[in-house]
Interface confidence: low
Amino acid sequence: GITIPRNPGCPNSEDKNFPRTVMVNLNIHNRNTNTNPKRSSDYYNRSTSPWNLHRNEDPERYPSVIWEAKCRHLGCINADGNVDYHMNSVPIQQEILVLRREPPHCPNSFRLEKILVSVGCTCVTPIVHHVA
Amino acid sequence: GITIPRNPGCPNSEDKNFPRTVMVNLNIHNRNTNTNPKRSSDYYNRSTSPWNLHRNEDPERYPSVIWEAKCRHLGCINADGNVDYHMNSVPIQQEILVLRREPPHCPNSFRLEKILVSVGCTCVTPIVHHVA
């Protein structure tokens, strides 16, 4: 195949670290309109496995604010509005990409990091272990 | 607040695009061990609002594979194992960062993109609108 000339606007890749270090444009292309999970829905209150949203803030990370869900109860809310301990409220987790400043306090140098966050809670049937 | 002096080992930031374009080290620091949501738990099957996981694949994006949750039912599973339509299964959504190569044909230049993914489902009490 023909080698297409590299776009002349490309960052220099003759670096000894290439391709371990890349340039990332932070002008985020946002395909969504609603960014605040507290405003996006009231599911956290209406769920049979309700949760609270805790603000996790870290200025050395991008995004600096991440909302973490914590289930309110061990059990789930039944039709009477009481906690039913025959069911379990459990967090639904998601692995996300974040950027961490590295070295620390450098405004334009980051490392990719994967972290696990709890997004909300769901009500599950418990796994019952029967003792013989 | 106190301004922390810039680390002298920081990369040069006198770029005309600074701080929109940053350097990112690709040696990902992964704080998690389990990356496949299908293996991480069986909540998607045990939930009262069960869901299926669909593979969303895009070779031009990092990560190229994202798992999307689709609720199996409009209602929720009751104690008898039947679908109760007095309750609603709804997706819990999370905004995540992904990387997309930009401009095209640059091997080491990317743009951050935010996308909304459904991580799992939860069972909620429906909002009932009473007609006067």
């Epitope: 391709p19 | 190229s64 990387l99």
Partner: nanobody, 119 residues
Framework: EVQLVESGGGLVQPGGSLRLSCAAS????????MYWVRQAPGKGLEWVAE????????YYVGGVKGRFTISRDNAKNSLYLQMNSLRAEDTAVYYC????????????WGQGTLVTVSS
């Protein structure tokens, strides 16, 4: 099941040539960029070359530019690396990899083929 099988390695004198091949199966080969990566004895992995889905765009690490050519045949689900003007420092196990758009992020690897450049 994804499989990548490399072949074509061997012993060659400095200045000589070799052509490595990689047979891919278990995924839609034409939908992915493909890579050659190498590991010299006692060293870490080094990304060597990348080729886009349709074969039209190739990227090379500085040290091999002008000497190595990456190519692919989507009809045969095959990836190739033509290596000319070989040097002692090219001695390594060469791996074919399917992966992400981020360099060095490969979700599947072959078993590798050893290339030894020595007189």
């Amino acid at each position: 099941e994804v499989q990548l099988v490399e072949s074509g390695g061997g012993l060659v004198q400095p200045g000589g040539s070799l052509r490595l091949s990689c047979a891919a199966s278990g995924f839609t080969f034409s939908s992915y960029s493909m890579y050659w990566v190498r590991q010299a004895p006692g060293k870490g992995l080094e990304w060597v070359a990348e080729i886009k889905q349709d074969g039209s765009v190739q990227y090379y690490v500085g040290g091999v530019k002008g000497r190595f050519t990456i190519s692919r045949d989507n009809a045969k689900n095959s990836l190739y690396l033509q290596m000319n003007s070989l040097r002692a420092e090219d001695t390594a196990v060469y791996y074919c990899a399917k992966g992400e758009i981020l360099p060095l992020y490969f979700d599947y690897w072959g078993q590798g083929t050893l290339v030894t450049v020595s007189s």
